[in-house]
């Protein structure tokens, strides 16, 4: 059935939440393989997912050395059967990924209340601090950890019997907030680096109202 | 011009420890994973897995896992091979390999190594 | 791990005549190479990727196959293509190489 020529990789790009980076491109192959190539701008050009089928290569390890630092990936075309290469001199079709920067870049993943709990009119919620893959001493850095005070939650919240939502913001992982007296609420909370142009929210969390297992009512 | 130079055949006793040698030249040696290939005497070949120079992440045949240690000295572009106690079964000639693409290929000229009481 | 067997493990021809090696895979493959080994020297790349010959490689040689089976075929033997031929796959870790098959002068 003839021979096919190699064709170069296309569409690359990033997908990353909370650190965890995927190199992702075009096309499914036919008679080639891809391995794929990260760099820092001034590092060795590192190969990882060697020989592939897939169109997607998990490049995580490599990001979170440093995640201040700018990385350029690059996906190889390699024949695999009966095909012909067509790059020069015999060396691989490539293609080069955009930029990417994960603590510029890295989506931010969707938060979860932890709990809430109410003192009189005080409610307490607290956001989970999420686990990222950055290590540190060979611990797994926290979401906060990371961003330190860059990172803002927005907190929404509203009376059961209503619809009228209030914000509150903190650059912790919890809010204090006071509320009217023999009234049930639901939050909803946000993460939100505000420095960011790009990628600056994450979705909302899911809603927690009171009078559900999360939270913890208190009469004072 | 590219080369591995592997350091000389060694002859051992059950239970030494050994370190053999490969330096890379011609070539930036940190840009390339090298392997580790073993062949022991009439038999065919066994990769035994793989290290990057920039960083010593290693990729590890399972089988060696407990048997044998990847380590590299980028200051003067040598990777290496140990063992911290020899068996008769590590009896073999052993390759190291720059981790190429298609025709680039570059191994060093082996270095023998014999365990006998 | 994938695990290549490689048939015959002795292959005795004449000069002229045509060598089919073969190498069947545990499990799928998508790159697999083949080294050509001659006595008391280091393996050299001789076909990757399935079908592609390595550099200085003559044309009387060729590779094919997909999946589980692959195939090195010589057509016409000359006298310096008595060596043993290794594949090896690289589609997953660890790497493997078949048991090798050694092509002897009748």
């Known amino acids: 059935s003839g021979t096919t020529n190699t064709v170069a990789a296309y569409n690359l790009t990033w997908k990353s939440t909370n650190f965890k980076t995927i190199l992702e491109w075009e096309p499914k192959p036919v008679n080639q393989v891809y391995t794929v190539q990260i760099s820092t701008k001034s590092g060795d050009w590192k190969s990882k997912c060697f020989y592939t089928t897939d169109t997607e290569c998990d490049l995580t390890d490599e990001i979170v050395k440093d995640v201040k630092q700018t990385y350029l990936a690059r996906v190889f075309s390699y024949p695999a059967g009966n095909v012909e290469s067509t790059g020069s001199a015999g060396e691989p079709l490539y293609e080069n990924s955009p930029e990417f920067t994960p603590y510029l870049e890295t989506n931010l993943g969707q938060p979860t209340i932890q709990s809430f709990e109410q003192v009189g009119t005080k409610v307490n919620v607290t956001v989970e601090d999420e686990r990222t893959l950055v290590r540190r001493n060979n611990t797994f850095l926290s979401l906060r950890d990371v961003f330190g005070k860059d990172l803002i939650y927005t907190l929404y919240y509203w009376k059961s019997s209503s619809s009228g939502k209030k914000t509150a913001k903190t650059n912790t992982n919890e809010f204090l907030i006071d509320v009217d007296k023999g009234e049930n609420y639901c939050f909803s909370v946000q993460a939100v680096i505000p420095s960011r142009t790009v990628n600056r929210k994450s979705t909302d969390s899911p809603v927690e109202c009171m009078g559900q297992e999360k939270g913890e009512f208190r009469e004072i | 011009e590219v080369q591995l130079v592997q350091s000389g055949a060694e002859v051992k006793k059950p239970g030494e420890s050994l370190k053999i040698s490969c330096k890379g030249s011609g070539y930036s040696f940190t840009s390339y994973w090298m392997n580790w290939v073993k062949q022991m005497p009439g038999k065919g070949l066994e990769w035994m897995g793989m290290i990057y120079p920039a960083d010593s992440e290693t990729r590890l045949n399972q089988k060696f896992k407990d048997k044998a240690t990847l380590s590299v000295d980028k200051s003067i572009s040598t990777a290496y091979l140990q063992w911290s106690s020899l068996k008769a079964s590590d009896t073999a000639m052993y390759y190291c390999?720059?981790?190429?693409?298609?025709?680039?290929?570059?191994w060093g000229q082996g270095t023998t190594v014999t365990v006998s009481s | 791990e994938i695990v290549l067997t490689q048939s015959p493990a002795t292959l005795s021809l004449s000069p002229g005549e045509r060598a089919t090696l073969s190498c069947s895979a545990s499990?799928?493959?998508?790159?697999m190479n083949w080294y050509q080994q001659k006595p008391g020297q280091s393996p050299r790349i001789w076909i990757y990727?399935?079908?592609n010959l390595a550099s200085g490689v003559p044309a009387r040689f060729s590779g094919s196959g997909s999946g589980t089976d692959f195939t090195l075929t010589i057509s016409s033997l000359e006298p310096e293509d008595f060596a043993v031929y290794y594949c090896q796959q690289k589609s997953s870790f660890p790497w493997t190489f078949g048991g090798g098959t050694k092509v002897e002068i009748k």
């Open positions: 390999a720059r981790e190429d693409y298609g025709s680039s290929d570059y």
């Open positions: 990727g399935i079908s």
């Open positions: 499990s799928s493959v998508s790159y």
